[in-house]
């Protein structure tokens, strides 16, 4: 299953399959997730080790048993790959690292005014993988405001150095934020020239394209089909690059197919997994296990659940079957692709779905109608769980926020439905940033069921929580995916990085905002909060957040939206925007429904609604 916990001051011994430099443990974990054999990782921050060569070291590890002995190492961080973690699987990494220079091949230098502009340039350059930016206070004046675009053979820095007044980060192309745009076209009977960066076997050109998309240096590819004239080259997928970023030439060639990486696509990237099953095909590889199962789909599920399994073959040979069950061969290889693809066999083959974003239907659960005051504009995909609850009567307007917590579930505030309990009038927009982008053609979700907490009473602040079941499940993308819920009764975690988002008013007597706003707000203890609200009862089922001096807060139109906190690299839904005295007033924090206190209720309602569990807490 999905294991998200991190082990501090611990290092996994042995099992090494690869090593690289990464700026933090989260990026190391992402590299482990996308490495075909990595199950575990250990990361050494700069502070944890004196050996300059091992600083920022990220060590990717495999283990037949799925675990390795942990040794104590001060400052080290270890953890698990996020294979099998559904919507948490993403190659997108937005963080910017201050005081760090990520080294690589510098292929472009320009002057820019901010690190954000440098990151944008990297994202809009086809070859850029990461960048470094020298701030205005950099010690050498001639380098100030320099934006260095970089790449390396493996897509990660060749070294990372601590350097004052330098900021580094990665391209946001894996976040589907590139302005370059992509070529979706597949060119039949055409072979591209240029440099081969890798060679793998794939059953079709589309698997080849997906592998190219997620390979750090692949810009385009050529695939030789299973009817290619040279038998030894059939099903070969050649991953390619060039100096210019495009093929320098192409040759008409029967039974070849060529195309481009989709990494530069805007708004949508292919899932990093291959779900198709190939009849009459045998995938060769190292045998992991053989089991008897009923049907090829069960064989694929078995492979997906066995974390080391990369691909499988389900044999229908009479000698491999007994009664209704046949042999399911679970296999793996060094690069995650079959070592041999044979046609005309009595079997079907396919891949593990361990890297699919969608996973199953389960979700990681790991007084004034209260926009964000004192906030700033959000960017695409920054808060992919945020939804806009809109009402369509004569006109259509945004009324509340909400949080996507599952394919078919949204969590919001009960008071959003005061006087508007009819599900037909509501439209739920997900995967959006600007309200002005909504037109009559913009897809929206309709409500199947509104479940208001049984103890909620209109005009009272208690139990201000409601679940919305959508009529149809939503697919997950970089711009539309769920937020993890906290563990039941989560009181021990100290959250220091919390944000509130919404399209609500920017001042008390304001108006709905066009661009989704975000504001970083510290949590306030319930005791402190109670002092500020002596006329109201602040219960243990509420959580407060705000600055003593005011100036930053949620406001009208943000209700029902998320208060999220990042802990150990993972975002969790800590609160639901509920109420407050005015907006952003001094010593008047915002009051939020404490989600952890309602976990039993959420699980009960999402399970009873259709008879099966929809949520699971993070391990």
């Amino acid at each position: 299953g999905c294991l998200t916990q991190l082990y501090e001051n611990a290092f996994f011994r042995g099992g090494d399959v690869a090593s690289m430099y990464t700026p933090n443990a989260q990026y190391c974990q992402m590299r482990c997730t996308f490495h075909p054999r990595c199950l575990l990782f250990s990361f050494l921050p700069a502070s944890s080790i004196n050996d300059m060569e091992k600083r920022f070291g990220c060590f990717l590890k495999d283990s037949v048993t799925g675990t390795l002995p942990k040794v104590h190492r001060t400052g080290a961080v270890s953890g698990h790959s996020l294979k099998q973690c559904g919507h948490q699987i993403s190659a997108c990494h937005r963080d910017i690292y201050k005081g760090v220079d990520m080294r690589g091949v510098n292929f472009n230098v320009s002057k820019v005014s901010s690190v954000e502009e440098c990151q944008k340039r990297c994202t809009s350059n086809i070859r850029c993988q990461f960048f470094s930016y020298a701030t205005q206070t950099f010690h050498k004046a001639e380098y100030r405001n320099n934006c260095l675009l970089k790449y390396s053979p493996g897509g990660t820095p060749t070294a990372i150095k601590v350097l004052s007044n330098v900021e580094s980060g990665f391209s946001l192309k894996p976040c589907a934020l590139s302005e370059i745009g992509c070529h979706m076209n597949i060119f039949q009977h055409l072979a591209f020239s240029d440099v081969d960066v890798a060679r793998v076997l794939t059953p079709d050109a589309f698997v080849c394209r997906t592998i190219c998309t997620y390979h750090p240096n692949c810009l385009f590819f050529t695939f030789y089909t299973n009817v290619w004239k040279i038998e030894s080259q059939r099903n070969v997928c050649l991953l390619k690059t060039s100096e210019s970023g495009t093929p320098s030439s192409s040759t008409p060639q029967e039974n070849t197919i060529s195309g481009y990486s989709l990494l530069t696509c805007k708004r949508t990237l292919p899932e990093p997994c291959h779900s198709k099953i190939y009849p009459g095909v045998d995938f060769g590889g190292e045998e992991l296990n053989v089991t008897f199962v009923k049907g090829v789909n069960v064989c694929q599920e078995t492979c997906t659940k066995m974390i080391r399994c990369q691909f499988f073959t389900y044999s229908l040979l009479p000698e491999d079957c007994k009664e209704e069950k046949c042999k399911c061969f679970l296999r793996l290889s060094m690069d995650g692709s079959p070592t041999r693809i044979a046609y005309g066999t009595q079997g079907s083959s396919g891949y593990s779905l361990r890297l699919c974003n969608t996973g199953d239907n389960s979700v990681c659960t790991t007084k004034t109608s209260t926009r964000i005051v004192g906030g700033t504009n959000s960017s695409w995909g920054e808060w992919p769980w945020q939804v806009s609850l809109q009402v369509k009567l004569t006109a259509q307007r945004h009324l509340c926020g909400g949080s996507l917590i599952g394919h078919q579930w949204v969590l919001t505030a009960a008071h959003c439905f005061d006087g508007l309990p009819l599900q037909d009038v509501w439209r739920i927009y997900s995967g959006i940033l600007n309200l002005s982008d909504i037109t009559k053609d913009t897809p929206f979700s309709q409500i199947k069921e509104i479940i208001i907490h049984q103890n909620y009473k209109v005009s009272e602040g208690n139990h201000d929580i409601a679940l919305i079941k959508l009529q149809a499940p939503l697919n997950y993308t970089e711009f539309q995916k769920p937020i993890c819920l906290p563990s039941k009764g989560d009181t021990s975690t100290i959250y220091t990085n919390c944000w509130v988002t919404g399209w609500g008013f920017s001042k008390e007597k304001g108006e709905i905002q066009n661009i989704l706003q975000k504001v970083n707000i510290p949590l306030v203890t319930n005791e402190e909060c109670q002092k500020r609200y002596q006329d109201y009862k602040i219960t243990q089922r509420m959580v407060c957040a705000g600055y003593k001096e005011g100036g930053k807060d949620a406001c009208k139109g943000d209700s029902g939206g998320p208060l999220v906190c990042k802990h150990n690299g993972m975002w969790r839904l800590v609160g639901i925007t509920s109420w407050g005295e005015g907006c952003a007033r001094r010593e008047q924090p915002g009051v939020y429904t404490k989600v952890a206190e309602y976990m039993d209720w959420i699980l009960e309602k999402t399970q009873s609604s259709d008879g099966k569990a929809q949520m699971q807490s993070p391990a």
């Epitope: 079709d204 198709k276 789909n297 005309g344 079907s348």
Partner: antibody
Framework: EVQLLESGGGLVQPGGSLRLSCAAS????????MMWVRQAPGKGLEWVSY????????DYADSVKGRFTISRDNSKNTLYLQMNSLRAEDMAVYYC????????????WGQGTMVTVSS | DIQMTQSPSSLSASVGDRVTITCRAS??????LNWYQQKPEKAPKLLIF???TLQSGVPSRFSGSGSGTDFTLTISNLQPEDFATYYC?????????FGLGTKVEVK
Amino acid sequence: EVQLLESGGGLVQPGGSLRLSCAASGFTFSMYPMMWVRQAPGKGLEWVSYISPSGGMTDYADSVKGRFTISRDNSKNTLYLQMNSLRAEDMAVYYCARVAGSSDAFDIWGQGTMVTVSS
Amino acid sequence: DIQMTQSPSSLSASVGDRVTITCRASQSISIYLNWYQQKPEKAPKLLIFAASTLQSGVPSRFSGSGSGTDFTLTISNLQPEDFATYYCQQSHSIPPTFGLGTKVEVK
């Protein structure tokens, strides 16, 4: 020219049998999976059966399982569909189609042969 | 089996119109969605495979998009020869399944 040509259709009584043939030309027949697809009068397309390039693997729609048999003779570049215990609901135009190696789409179709089941 | 739902079942349009046909799969089929054109008394003809790739020889006014469960076929500038029935088909899983078809008629 890449071509598929069906034959063997005709009128048959319920419970009767018929054998359809599909002659392939213009491509290396032995390297492609093949399919039979049918279309009842005025209706949509329905997949009937699949066979792998060597003939080692076959599959059938539930509606014909146990009654129809797909086979191929790669030396003759010919695909067959043996239809037994025919029913009124089997009445349709039967098409053979080549399965493209690149996508599993049906990229080449025959012109179709009509099977009429009537007493 | 994966169900394919096509809409509309028929539509009336004029030469030069932009026509859009949608197809929804009952479960995710990645990009393994194909579109066919069939004229009366003729065999179907492959137009688009893998959701968006134009089959050789098919005019560029035909385009396809989508992935997962929702797909679209667009004819950008309808020509007289385009009046026909269009079928979507998934090739993601055995058995391959077709939509019920969309008949594009003259307005």
